[in-house]
């Protein structure tokens, strides 16, 4: 009972029930209409047949589909369900009495006025484009602008409320009962999104009569989520009339699938969320609407929310990075596929592996850090887009490097210092993802120290001089030695070597000019001297 491509939804009466089965294809977009049978008499057992609404978004690559209708025909979605089987004649006014009259049905007062959810996430709707080439969500859904269709099995019962008078003629051939004829009837609902109404079409029964009218003339302009009870159905070749109930589904354009994946988790997670737009839950019984979502190849991950439509996030975690997943997201109406979206989602780039750096043979003020080219493991890590190299002694400096370099000369270092180098690889996906930092360390070689600071000379006695100073800003080596050279008239007088800069020079000549030169030696190199001139006094004695 696959309908021809014609934007329709369908229902059937008194269907034979099959065991529940619902194969969800991987990487295929079906156009075969789904169908459901709901058995009457209180049973809610259902039968599924695969089906889908399919519209490829422009940024998606179409999936193979040998059954896709030609461009000339609209995509179809068929919904099949068996409506409830009324067994009693309604009292006059049946289910149609307004409040205050006999037979009134009380309207629940607790139904919220409007529980539609705001659409605040960018919808994966037609003509949208993926935010990032590394995490694209490709939605296939029926182009309901031209209509969608659904098929339901509707149970029938004897038309006890029928207005046809009983026949008094004895026929020589027994007519088939209308209950039997309409017991398996398929009703195709075609959605007209332009005016948001449905047309119902009773399939496989010629010249079906709804009451006194041709059914095809009256089963149109049906409001979504409406419920029509005790419709008298018959045709020329059956008697007596039987009744069916119709449950018109919500418009398929009321549902949209949204990508709710947090950017931070987009490499290992897929989050999808059905949202409703302009779906009036005062009218539409949310208990009739449910959803199923799962993604291949992760067979075990499935989100199911049955019996009530509470738009909530379905997040599948622990997925592989940079992997194509085919996700099947379905909205079920009374247990039947109303909307089925097949979405291709590629998880974001994975965390890259960082190669181990080598710190090389350092000089006093620079060293070469090098690392091997990363071996790409596409199943787990992504090829880096670049590197961040940091080096620190007390403070840290970092440098961003392109992904085509495998070495970097670190310059402007301080001599004779311990440095730690960290290298991390990163990728730019929805966010920048950094690999684990790998480290190496080194010690720069010694270099000439700076000059001593704050050199002072003083004359405690007529023929002695005190010399003091502070350490250099940078000693640049392992040891601390202060060297004092005393000169007079350009000639060497004496030399001192101490580990602190406090020199007492006595027994100098009276009334003589001296030159005092202090330098620092770090055990490897000697620095420049600082010079002070001082004269001894005449001998006061």
């Amino acid at each position: 009972q696959t309908p021809t491509p014609s934007d329709e939804l369908s229902t059937t009466e008194n269907a034979l029930l099959l065991p529940q089965s619902d194969p969800l294809p991987a990487r295929t977009t079906e156009s075969t209409p789904p169908s459901i049978s709901e058995r009457g008499n209180g049973s809610s057992e259902t039968t599924y047949h695969p089906g889908v609404l399919s519209t490829l978004l422009p940024h998606l690559s179409p999936q193979p589909d040998s059954q896709t209708p030609s461009a000339g025909g609209a995509d179809t979605q068929t919904f099949s369900s068996q409506a409830d089987n009324p067994t009693l004649t309604p009292a006059p006014g049946g289910g149609t009495d307004p409040p205050g009259v006999p037979g009134e049905r009380t309207v629940p007062g607790t139904i919220p006025a409007d529980t539609a959810f705001p659409v605040d996430t960018p919808s994966l709707a037609r003509n949208s484009s993926a935010a990032s080439p590394t995490h694209t969500s490709n939605v296939s859904t029926t182009d309901i602008s031209s209509g969608a269709s659904l098929t339901t099995l509707t149970p029938s019962t004897l038309g006890l409320a029928s207005t046809d008078p009983p026949s008094t003629t004895i026929a020589t051939t027994t007519k088939q009962t209308c209950a039997a004829m309409f017991g398996n009837i398929t009703v195709n609902y075609t959605y007209e999104s332009s005016n948001q109404t449905f047309k119902a079409d009773l399939k496989d029964v010629q010249n079906a009569k709804c009451g006194n009218e041709d059914c095809e003339n009256v089963l149109n302009n049906l409001e979504e989520c409406s419920q029509i009870k005790n419709i008298s159905v018959s045709n020329d070749s059956c008697a007596p009339a039987t009744t069916i109930d119709l449950y018109v589904p919500p418009g398929t354009d009321k549902f949209s699938l949204h990508d709710c994946t947090p950017k931070e988790k987009a490499n290992t997670s897929i989050c999808l969320e059905w949202k409703t737009k302009n779906l009036d839950f005062r009218k539409c019984n949310s208990d009739n609407i449910s959803y199923v979502l799962h993604c291949e190849p992760e067979n075990n991950t499935k989100c199911i929310r049955r019996n009530t439509f509470i738009p909530e996030r379905c997040q599948l975690d622990n997925l592989r990075a940079q992997t194509n997943y085919t996700c099947v997201a379905e909205i079920l109406y009374r247990g039947v596929k109303l909307v089925k979206n097949v979405i291709n989602v590629q998880t974001d780039l994975g965390i890259p592996e960082t190669p181990k750096p080598s710190c090389g043979d350092p000089a006093a003020r620079k060293t070469l850090v090098s690392w091997p080219e990363p071996v790409s493991k596409p199943e787990s890590a992504s090829k880096p887009h670049g590197y961040v190299l940091c080096y620190k002694n007390n403070s840290e400096k970092c440098k961003s490097l392109p992904n085509n370099v495998t070495s970097f000369e670190v310059e402007s270092l301080k001599p004779y210092k311990y440095y730690e180098v960290s290298l991390l690889a990163y990728v730019n996906g929805k966010i920048q993802r950094n690999g684990t930092a790998e480290k190496c360390n080194f010690h720069t070689k010694a270099d000439r120290p700076d000059k001593v600071n704050g050199m002072k000379t003083s004359r405690p006695t007529d023929n002695s001089i005190n010399v003091t100073c502070g350490p250099p800003y940078e000693t640049n080596g392992p040891k601390t030695f202060y060297i004092l050279v005393v000169r007079s008239g350009g000639s060497f007088v004496t030399k001192y070597n101490k580990t602190n800069c406090q020199f007492y020079v006595d027994n100098l000549y009276y009334s003589t000019d001296y030159e005092f030169l202090v330098s620092f030696h770090n055990g490897v190199y000697e620095g420049d001297s600082v010079i002070r001139n001082e004269s001894t006094n005449f001998n006061a004695k």
């Epitope: 149609t96 049905r105 207005t163 009451g211 059914c215 409001e223 018109v248």
Partner: nanobody, 119 residues
């Protein structure tokens, strides 16, 4: 919103016929039940006849005498009343009722048209 305007009421003799019309405008759907109710002084409003997707329902008191029909293209519901009796005298109200799968239903009423059957 749905607006309903009735017409066709009047004063007739017992046994005569009368045809009431109710024109609906606004958000009118074929899935809604349209019908006629009547109320005579001192009584409650009672069902006369309803129709939805071609299927009519009648009160026992009018079966065989009244016929309800609906022109979906024009959104008009008619009540053909034959063999009128004095007890059919009442104000006749047109009703539009949408019933939903949630159990919620919404009613709209016309202003009413007077039918008087007197000999």
């Amino acid at each position: 919103q749905v607006q309903l305007v009735e017409s066709g009421g009047g004063l007739v003799h017992p046994g005569d016929s009368l045809r009431l019309s109710c024109a609906a405008s606004g958000s009118v759907f074929n899935s809604a039940t349209m019908g006629w109710y009547r109320q005579s002084p001192g009584s409650q409003r009672e069902l006369v006849a309803t129709i939805v997707v071609g299927t009519p329902t009648y009160a026992d008191s009018v079966k065989g005498r009244f016929t309800i029909s609906r022109d979906n293209a024009k959104n008009i519901v008619y009540l053909q009343m034959n063999s009128l009796k004095p007890e059919d005298t009442a104000v006749y109200y047109c009703n539009y009722r949408a019933t939903y799968t949630s159990g919620y239903s919404r009613d709209y009423w016309g202003q009413g048209t007077q039918v008087t059957v007197s000999g």
